[in-house]
């Protein structure tokens, strides 16, 4: 008894396609070895045709595919375009010779069936509409056409010239003439179902004077696409249903068991366990779209379905597209926090993975919005400017080589929760998703910086201070100066550094950052935080206005815009934020990249010197730990 | 809702043949998996043989214990499934269930069908 098993007789039709799946007992040794396919030949000897090694053989070439499937103990050979020549006893198995582990597969591919003479054979998908095509001679141009379905040696009529209609064909058969043609009729079945299959005949006239011809019509359920994903990565499923459903709502659903269970739809249904990691982007006016899922999970593995109806919902008798889905639990995108949660006021660090082998990639942060069919705008990205109403309070630090990225958010409000989008320009499989829960501060925050009303005078002298507790102690701390492109760590003095860590005073650990002589291109968003190596920890920020002391003119504070940051609601900044992103409405964000990197390149000279002339204060040596 | 009604149990000497039949009623599907599973008396119900039909082509499994004996075949247009059991042992008498699968996915051994049938007695007698 072989452990490997299949099945044992597999039988199509030329020009078909065949899959065939082969299930083996789950050892760590199985699911890694090698995986065959080969022929039985008469001498015993059996003839690879195609492996998991790569190997494929020239009869097989361009039309056959191996696929392993780890987490399912499985492995599947596809075949296309099949002959009669593919007749044969074959063997699935595993091991590096073809005596290993197998099971006997005997494969038989017929001809396409005989029908009666003059049968025109019509392939159609579920759904979709055919047209039948009926001659008949001059002598029956006045005559009743009529088209009949044969049921065993019945003939039960569809549709009739005399406008009779079978109740199950209502308002999906019509007979029809085109233009002046006195020897054709036509009947058009439409949303066809799988019951419709069968053999047609169309007459016209009756008796022995009638003409007759005979229609086979085969109605095909779409063989699924498999896709294998692994855990945590993200899966598109392309749907091109036609322009005869172009103007009708689409929909993804999930099968169970007869019925489809709908995930999303463009109705605004959504399946709240893909809530945050889901979107459906229309893709032109032909009725093509697709559906992004990001953060796969185990059970999301299953048949999936993608469709067309007025009611969003799946129908008989409408098209659709079918994938089955395998999740691969032996994944390479590392397990990170799916929940993050802050305090209004205070900060997040979140660290977005992404292929290492891909460092140079574009990298980029959005936030899903649950509008109808889900959406991602981009909020900040290694060459895309800061969205509006995050300036000051957003920022990307890539750390190439590390395979990971860190997004800070800080000046938090609870509107900031939701979910978040680490996605890169490079492997569409590196996708996560994040969920910020933000909840209101129930104390002061860690870090706090002094004077909060921060104006400096062009020409002076101007300090700023940012006081942390001593659980900070041992990590480094940093002030970065806020831009577009990111935010730039500047030379900055640890008073706190100085003392022993015994004995550390709560009240004095204190970082500073000198700007000296204040220059007006200083102006601008400040962060203090805290770091260990490369792991980014809290940030508090501060808006440094600067302004000109003019001689005898008393001083007068610009608006505080740390206030506006810490308490004002931001509806004003969303507001003007989707009314920039409303015509990008369902966009990939990697489309629209190109454009943010465009506007944002005039800014970058700019910044760089500032950030150079922020940290030029007068005696200062750097940085201090 | 789909219902499965198996007919052809009864009473067979060893050696003898059977034909057990299941029709399902309901909706027409063009892909999915049919099979035939078995419960002897004070044992576990195990596998004996499924028919997959997907995308126009036909599979067919069989259990090791009835392969070159039993035979199944079906027409899945008219919802049916036929299981021809030749050269029968009284170590085949169980009842025999039909069991119908909605996708034609899955190891067709397992137990994660959509519908089961009542079942027929077929009893061998030696």
């Known amino acids: 008894q072989s452990p490997i098993f299949g099945p044992q007789d597999v039988s199509s039709i030329e020009g078909n396609s065949v899959s065939i799946t082969c299930y083996y007992p789950d050892t760590s040794v199985n699911r890694h070895t090698r995986k065959y396919w080969c022929r039985q030949g008469a001498n015993g000897y059996c003839a690879t045709l195609i492996s998991s090694n790569g190997y494929l053989s020239k009869e097989y070439s361009g039309r056959a595919s191996l696929i392993n499937f780890p987490e399912n103990s499985t492995f599947v050979i596809n075949i296309a375009h099949l002959t009669q020549e593919d007749t044969g006893s074959y063997k699935c198995g595993l091991g590096t010779t073809n005596r290993g582990l197998f099971f006997d597969v005997s494969l038989e591919v017929s001809q396409v069936p005989e029908f009666p003479n003059d049968t025109h054979v019509y392939t159609k998908d579920i759904g979709r509409t055919v047209t039948i095509e009926c001659r008949f001679k001059e002598g029956n141009a006045h005559s009743k056409k009529s088209l009949c379905k044969k049921r065993g040696e019945a003939c039960e009529v569809v549709i009739d010239s005399t406008e009779y209609v079978d109740p199950s064909y209502k308002d999906r058969a019509i007979l029809f003439m085109k233009g002046t043609s006195r020897d054709i009729f036509y009947v058009n079945i439409s949303h066809l179902i799988p019951s419709d299959a069968g053999l047609y005949v169309c007459q016209a006239g009756e008796g022995p004077s009638a003409d007759k011809n005979n229609a086979d019509l085969q109605v095909l359920e779409p063989e699924p696409e498999l896709l294998y994903k692994d855990l945590r990565s993200s899966v598109t499923f392309e749907c091109d249903l036609g322009r005869e459903v172009a103007n009708d709502a689409k929909y993804l659903c999930r099968k169970n068991k007869e019925t489809c269970d709908v995930i999303i739809n463009t109705l605004g249904k959504r399946d709240p366990a893909f809530e945050g990691r889901i979107l459906l982007t229309p893709r032109d006016d032909n009725g093509r779209f697709s559906v992004l899922i990001t953060g796969l999970r185990k059970e999301d593995a299953g048949h999936y379905q993608c469709g067309a109806h007025s009611s969003g919902l799946p129908q008989e008798g409408w098209p659709v597209q079918a994938w089955q889905l395998f999740v691969n639990e032996e994944s390479t995108i590392p397990n990170s926090r799916s929940v993050v949660k802050g305090v209004t006021g205070g900060s997040v660090a979140i660290v977005c993975p992404y292929n290492p082998k891909e460092s140079s990639s574009l990298k980029y942060w959005c936030h899903w919005e649950a509008d109808e069919n889900g959406r991602c705008p981009v909020l900040v990205g290694t060459q895309a400017l800061v969205q509006e109403g995050y300036e000051g309070r957003l920022a990307l630090f890539d750390q190439p080589g590390s395979g990971a990225y860190t997004v800070i958010l800080n000046q938090l409000t609870t509107q900031d929760s939701g979910f978040y989008w680490c996605l890169t320009d490079g492997d569409s499989r590196w996708r996560t998703t994040i969920e910020l829960q933000v909840a209101e501060a129930t104390k002061k925050p860690d870090l706090e910086v002094t004077p909060q009303n921060a104006t400096a005078v062009i020409g002076e002298t101007f300090t700023i201070s940012c006081h942390y507790p001593c659980k900070f102690y041992s990590q480094e701390k940093y002030w970065c100066k806020w831009s577009n492109d990111g935010c730039h760590i500047l030379p900055s003095h640890d008073e706190g550094a100085r003392q022993s860590s015994v004995s550390c005073d709560q009240s004095s650990q204190i970082v500073s950052m000198t700007l000296n002589p204040v220059k007006k291109e200083d102006e601008g968003w400040y962060w203090c935080g805290v770091k260990e190596g490369q792991v980014y920890g809290e940030t508090t920020a501060i808006y440094v206005a600067v302004e000109e002391r003019t001689r005898g003119s008393p001083h007068i504070n610009p608006t505080d815009a740390n206030a506006r940051a810490k308490d004002a609601p931001e509806e004003e900044a969303m507001e003007s934020s989707v009314r920039e992103d409303e015509n990008k409405a369902n966009l990939d964000p990697r489309l629209f990249a190109d454009e943010r990197e465009i506007q944002n390149a005039g800014d970058q000279a700019q910044e760089n010197r500032a950030s150079g002339n922020a940290g030029s204060a007068g005696g200062q040596s750097g940085s201090s730990k | 809702q789909v219902q499965l009604v198996e007919s052809g149990g009864g009473l067979v000497q060893a050696g003898g043949s059977l034909r057990l039949s299941c029709a399902a009623s309901?909706?027409?599907?063009?892909?999915?998996?049919m099979g035939w599973f078995r419960q002897a008396p004070g044992k576990e119900r195990e596998f004996v043989t499924a028919?997959?039909?997907?995308?126009?082509?036909?599979?067919?499994y069989y259990a090791d214990s009835v392969k070159g004996r039993f035979t199944i075949s079906g027409d899945n247009a008219r919802n049916t499934v036929d299981l021809q059991m030749n050269s029968l042992k009284p170590e085949d008498t169980a009842v025999y269930y039909c069991?119908?699968?909605?996708?034609?996915?899955?190891?067709?051994?397992?137990?994660?069908?959509?519908?089961w049938g009542q079942g027929t007695l077929v009893t061998v007698s030696s």
């Open positions: 309901g909706r027409a599907f063009s892909q999915y998996t």
């Open positions: 069991a119908a699968r909605m996708s034609p996915w899955g190891d067709p051994r397992g137990n994660e069908y959509d519908y």
């Open positions: 028919i997959r039909w997907s995308g126009g082509s036909i599979y067919k």
